[in-house]
């Protein structure tokens, strides 16, 4: 569909004569008629295939035609068409003398023609007007003609319709040959896909509207490159959705079981060693001078009673020393000046003589010890406390602290390691001699059954169109993350698709 | 009075050349699509080419594409014909001819011969 | 190409009678045809053209009639001068083709 314009620039006539030769009376009040028609190989009479057009009256003998809406009529004047644009045309032009004020065809005389004349053209679509003279003995007519496509109509010949839009069909202007040109943000044949914020993950991001980025169920981030972990996953990650994998020093289905508690919690205090044994467990090696579990207590170094022969022991910073009683000397105090005859033996230790009494030995009475009996016996030092408890006198008695998994009175009963219940879904613990073992139900594994293996929703291929299938292993249930195109939670459903021309 | 006179044509070899022209006159030559007409001794009418009033289209009889070129100038009111590689086939009286019969304009020259032979 | 073909190849009629000769256009050419007059040595004279309008200076005995592929042209009382090759010629598209011509003889 488009327009044949013709602007009539200029007609001379200068004697004011029909084509008959006759004068006109008063002057020639010339109008024109045009025809515009197929292209023939040798232009001949009629119908005017392509359209016709008449002017009012435009002027006397030789007048220039303005480029406006001159006395009611249009230049230039439109010869619109609503078929493909060919290429070629055959145009009539006619000048004729208006008697009076009717210009119908049947109201003139048939000597009233002024001029004729009839062209071949070729003329392309939207070309700058094309200026053409025809002369003859008695008149010259100016003028020049185009051809422009209408609104919405584009191409070489005005047959490729394209209109503008910006709504759920698409986002587009048209360009000059009628191809769509997609607004800023859109892309696709009829610019109705948006273009998604700038590195939006091709599969687990999508968008509605140019620039965003909306993450499919799994998915997560400005860029939906980040996975979503499992539900309540405390210590762990993830690599597809859903998952749970654990960080170094943490176990079980939701990464919560602490199996690196040394690292974790620095439990142990001046500057002993800590070793794992276990979820929550651990063993302190203390270094010298300290004490506790967790090597929190300071040994004096006097309380293992160092000094021998009633010496007695003062701390130092670095260590200790003994101040020997009369008789004795050495660095415990274990050399003695004395012989039998000075009665060392206290509480009623026997002296019996050594060395040609050079020397002598106390046999001492029970509960007490020592070279000279002096000390009363420490129930600690027969290491009384099984498992590595630890031995502390308490006055007349003594008591053991033991180690995490021992019990009894010495250290003696291993506590069941399964008495926390560590086997997770139902799983049945065995004590063993260091440590335990879980025998897990169908569908669990790991070390404490924590790992589900069996139930996976995915197995069954339930996601449509190429999806990717996720398991959400608190539910057993499946998660299905669709192509671009498709919706549903099996993604079973196409994005409605537009009609071939959505106009 | 309206005259087309043509002349160039002549005995000339397969493979030559010849150049054609018609020279017009007594009407308004730039005014009129014209044509190169021949008829072949013993032969009906066959149309050669075409030329529109103002050069800008020209169409050509399949036999001769490629080979003949229609031209005009206006200036002079004078048509032409470029006859390269002839063949025998194209031996005939060779007419230039105004014709539109919107306007009843039909007018004939009385063509010029060209003979290719060897 | 639009294939013109004139029948008869000959026709022979007495003066004074009507002759009529008839032009077949391989497909339709919308009126587009011109009927001439050929004498030897002369250049063709045109009669008719649009189908049916006479060309002017041609006497009035001359006519055409005719649309879509089948035209006629008719000499309704024959004179002397008449007596020549006439062939019709299409004008609706390239290549123009001309029908092969009916030869009107003296009977």
């Known amino acids: 569909s488009g327009v044949f314009q013709l602007q009539l620039q200029e007609f001379i006539n200068e004697r004011g004569v029909l084509a008959s030769g006759r004068p006109c009376e008063p002057g020639c009040r010339t109008f024109f008629r045009v025809c515009l028609k197929h292209f023939q190989a040798v232009v001949s009479p009629g119908p005017c295939t392509f359209g016709t057009v008449s002017t009012p009256v435009l002027g006397t003998n030789s007048f220039a035609v303005r480029d406006d809406s001159s006395g009611g009529g249009r230049n230039p004047l439109q010869l619109p068409f609503n078929f493909t644009w060919p290429g070629t045309f055959s145009l009539i032009i006619e000048a004729w003398h208006a008697p009076g004020d009717d210009l119908r065809p049947e109201a003139l005389p048939p000597d009233a023609l002024i001029s004729k004349i009839a062209i071949q053209g070729s003329l392309a679509v939207g070309q700058n007007w094309l200026l053409d003279e025809q002369t003859s003995t008695l008149t010259r007519l100016r003028y020049s003609y185009r051809v422009i496509c209408s609104d919405n109509y584009y191409g070489d010949n005005c047959s490729r319709l394209c209109k503008k839009r910006n709504d759920h069909f698409g986002h587009y202007v048209c360009q000059p040959d009628g191809n769509l040109s997609c607004l800023p943000g859109w892309t696709g044949e009829y610019c109705q896909q948006p273009i998604c914020l700038s590195g939006c993950h091709e599969q687990n991001g999508y968008c509605s509207k140019p620039a965003e980025c909306l993450c499919r169920p799994g998915w997560q981030g400005r860029l939906c490159n980040e996975c979503i972990p499992h539900n309540g996953c405390r210590h762990g990650t993830c690599s597809t959705p859903w998952q749970c994998t654990c960080d170094e020093g943490w176990g079980g289905l939701f990464c919560d079981q602490d199996l690196n508690y040394c690292t974790h919690h620095s439990p142990c205090k001046n500057g002993a060693t800590c070793s794992n044994s276990g979820q929550r467990s651990y063993t302190c090696t203390c270094r010298p001078g300290y004490t506790g579990v967790d090597c929190e207590l300071e040994l004096s170094e006097c309380d293992s009673n160092p000094c021998r022969n009633g010496g007695s022991c003062k701390d130092q910073e670095d260590g200790y020393h003994c101040l020997c009683p009369p008789g004795y000397y050495g660095l415990h105090c274990e050399h003695s000046t004395l012989s039998c005859a000075d009665s060392p033996c206290f509480n009623g230790g026997s002296c019996r003589e050594r060395n040609q009494g050079a020397n002598y030995a106390c046999e001492c009475p029970p509960n007490f010890t020592g070279s000279n009996c002096e000390k009363k016996v420490d129930r600690c030092t027969s290491n009384p406390c099984a498992n590595g408890g630890q031995c502390l006198n308490r006055g007349p008695s003594r008591m053991c602290r033991c180690r995490p998994g021992f019990t009894g009175t010495y250290c003696e009963l291993h506590v069941s390691d399964c008495a926390r219940n560590p086997c997770a879904h139902g799983g049945t613990c065995h004590d063993l001699e260091n440590g335990l073992m879980c025998t897990c139900p169908a569908g669990f594994s790991g070390r404490r059954c924590e790992v589900r293996t069996s139930i996976d929703a995915c197995a069954s291929s339930p996601c449509f169109n190429r999806a990717t299938c996720y398991t959400d292993l608190s539910t057993d249930t499946f998660v299905c993350n669709c192509p671009y195109g498709f919706v549903g939670s099996r993604c079973e459903f196409p994005v409605g698709l537009p009609p071939s021309f959505p106009w | 009075e309206v005259q087309l006179v043509e002349s160039g044509g002549g005995v000339v070899q397969p493979g030559r050349s010849l150049r054609l022209s018609c020279a017009a006159s007594?009407?308004?030559?730039?005014?009129?699509?014209m044509y190169w007409i021949r008829q072949a001794p013993g032969k009906g009418l066959e149309w050669v080419a075409f030329?529109?009033?103002?050069?800008?289209?020209?169409y050509y009889r399949d036999s001769v594409k490629g080979r003949f070129t229609i031209s005009r100038d206006n200036s002079k009111s004078t048509l032409y014909l470029q006859m390269n590689s002839l063949r025998a086939e194209d031996t005939a009286v060779y007419h230039c001819?105004?014709?539109?019969?919107?306007?009843?304009?039909?007018?004939w020259g009385q063509g010029t011969m060209v003979t290719v032979s060897s | 190409e639009i294939v013109m073909t004139q029948s008869p190849a000959t026709l022979s009629v007495s003066p004074g009678e009507r002759a009529t000769l008839s032009c077949r256009a391989s497909?339709?050419?919308?009126?587009?045809l011109a009927w001439y007059q050929k004498k030897p040595g002369q250049s063709p004279r045109l009669l008719i053209y649009?189908?049916?309008r006479l060309q002017d200076g041609v006497p009035a005995r001359f006519s055409g009639s005719g649309s879509g592929t089948e035209y006629t042209l008719t000499i309704s009382s024959l004179q002397s001068e008449d007596f020549a090759v006439y062939f019709c010629?299409?004008?609706?598209?390239?290549?123009?083709?001309f029908g092969q011509g009916t030869k009107l003889e003296i009977k």
């Open positions: 030329i529109s009033h103002g050069g800008g289209i020209t």
């Open positions: 649009a189908a049916n």
């Open positions: 001819a105004a014709l539109n019969w919107e306007l009843g304009i039909d007018y």
């Open positions: 497909e339709d050419i919308y009126s587009n």
């Open positions: 010629l299409q004008g609706s598209k390239f290549p123009l083709t």
């Open positions: 007594g009407f308004t030559f730039s005014n009129y699509g």
